[in-house]
């Protein structure tokens, strides 16, 4: 790594993956192991994120980019850059302080994460219940009884929500 020649700031020519070493006459030195600099002109390198415990490594740290974490099986990522891992529950459950608990009657959760939500109230839209709700599925609303005349079109139930993955959001 050669010494930079910038008149303004001798550190400005230090590329990503290096730092401007004040202890060595502002020479561009490579980032030490387990550290990185993602932009040029940095005076220090950042310590790499450690994906430990409930976090696991999705992408290894390099000299120019931080490590990326996701969560171990049985947990899912939350937050920007997977800053948190939350325990999975089964469909039909929600996570409480005391662990996974079944959804109360009248509520459902079709994912392994999140909270139980109330069944749709079909009558608010002037419709009737075509398929009863369960802990895992919302009710399916059908046409109102008045619409059930010969020739009326059938109702297609909504597709189930996609299961969340374990990758960062």
């Amino acid at each position: 790594f050669e010494r930079t020649r910038s008149l303004q700031d001798p550190c400005s020519n230090c590329p990503a993956g290096t730092f401007c070493d004040n202890n060595r006459n502002q020479i561009c030195s490579p980032c030490p192991p387990n550290s990185f600099s993602s932009a040029g002109g940095q005076r220090t390198c950042d310590i790499c994120r450690q994906c430990k415990g409930v976090f696991r490594t999705r992408k290894e740290c390099s000299s120019t980019s931080n490590a990326e974490c996701d969560c171990t099986p049985g947990f899912h990522c939350l937050g920007a850059g997977c800053s948190m891992c939350e325990q999975d529950c089964k469909q039909g459950q929600e996570l409480t302080k005391k662990g996974c608990k079944d959804c109360c009657f009248g509520t459902f959760n079709d994912q392994k994460r999140g909270i139980c939500r109330p069944w749709t109230n079909c009558s608010l839209d002037g419709k009737s219940v075509l398929v009863n709700g369960t802990k895992e599925r919302d009710v399916v609303c059908g046409p109102s009884p008045a619409d059930l005349s010969p020739g009326a079109s059938s109702v297609t139930p909504p597709a189930p929500a996609r299961e969340p993955g374990h990758s960062p959001q």
């Epitope: 994120r49 450690q50 415990g53 409930v54 939350l78 800053s83 959001q169």
Partner: antibody, heavy 116, light 107 residues
């Protein structure tokens, strides 16, 4: 430079609700989290919950479950925190803070006073 | 919940002194630890994240170390503007929790 600007001080009576806003400006294009932290007089900060600006995902501390609602208005780049069923123990300063990892940018705080 | 305990709760020091504040977690948090400085009537200000990374714009006299359950914030040479309250905070497990604070006062 990221800036978080919170709404003004509030005085409430026990049993009431309070809704505080936190407007983000500057680099608000990235996917980041807005956390809410409260601090009672002379006490340590207490984490309340967060919302993700990208997908609206939100979680609250179990201590406040059922009493706190955190929302995000994308068009206004503003987070809101509503706390219901207030008691005198809810008196304190409420902060919003942005995080792409640590809580790196904070709002100025909103003083909430609950008294009869 | 993970309990964060700081020591000492307060200390008196002079300008130029080396100051060390410790923080202990009730269970292992790897390097998911941050340090904040808070002055009266102001929001906390991030100093150190991921145990030892200095936040941009923070003077190099602040440093952090540790791993697992025991962590340290060091101010190598105390300056007049450093008199404040310091908090550690873990972000390994929700709810994120803070230490009770260490107040650094002028001797």
């Amino acid at each position: 430079q990221v800036q978080l600007v919170q709404s003004g001080a509030e005085e409430k009576t026990p049993g009431a609700s309070v809704k505080i806003s936190c407007k983000a400006s500057g680099n608000t294009f990235n996917n980041y989290d807005i956390h809410w932290v409260r601090q009672a007089p002379g006490e340590r900060p207490e984490w309340m919950g967060w919302i993700n600006s990208g997908n609206g995902d939100t979680r609250n501390s179990q201590k406040f479950q059922g009493r706190v609602t955190i929302t995000w208005d994308t068009s206004a780049s503003t987070a809101y925190m509503e706390l219901s069923s207030l008691t005198s123990e809810d008196t304190g300063v409420y902060f919003c803070a942005r995080a792409e990892g640590p809580l790196d940018y904070w709002g100025q705080g909103t003083l909430v006073t609950v008294s009869s | 919940d993970i309990v964060m305990t700081q020591s000492p709760s307060s200390l008196s020091a002079s300008v130029g002194d080396r100051v060390t504040i410790t923080c202990r977690a009730s269970q292992g948090i790897y390097n998911y630890l941050a340090w904040y400085q808070q002055k009266l009537g102001k929001a906390p200000n991030l100093l150190i994240y991921a145990t030892s990374n200095l936040q941009s714009g923070v003077p190099s006299r602040f440093s952090g170390s540790g791993s697992g359950t025991d962590f340290t914030l060091t101010i190598s040479s105390l300056q007049p503007e450093d008199f404040a309250t310091y908090y550690c905070q873990q972000s390994y497990s929700t709810p994120w929790t803070f230490g009770q604070g260490t107040k650094v006062e002028i001797k």
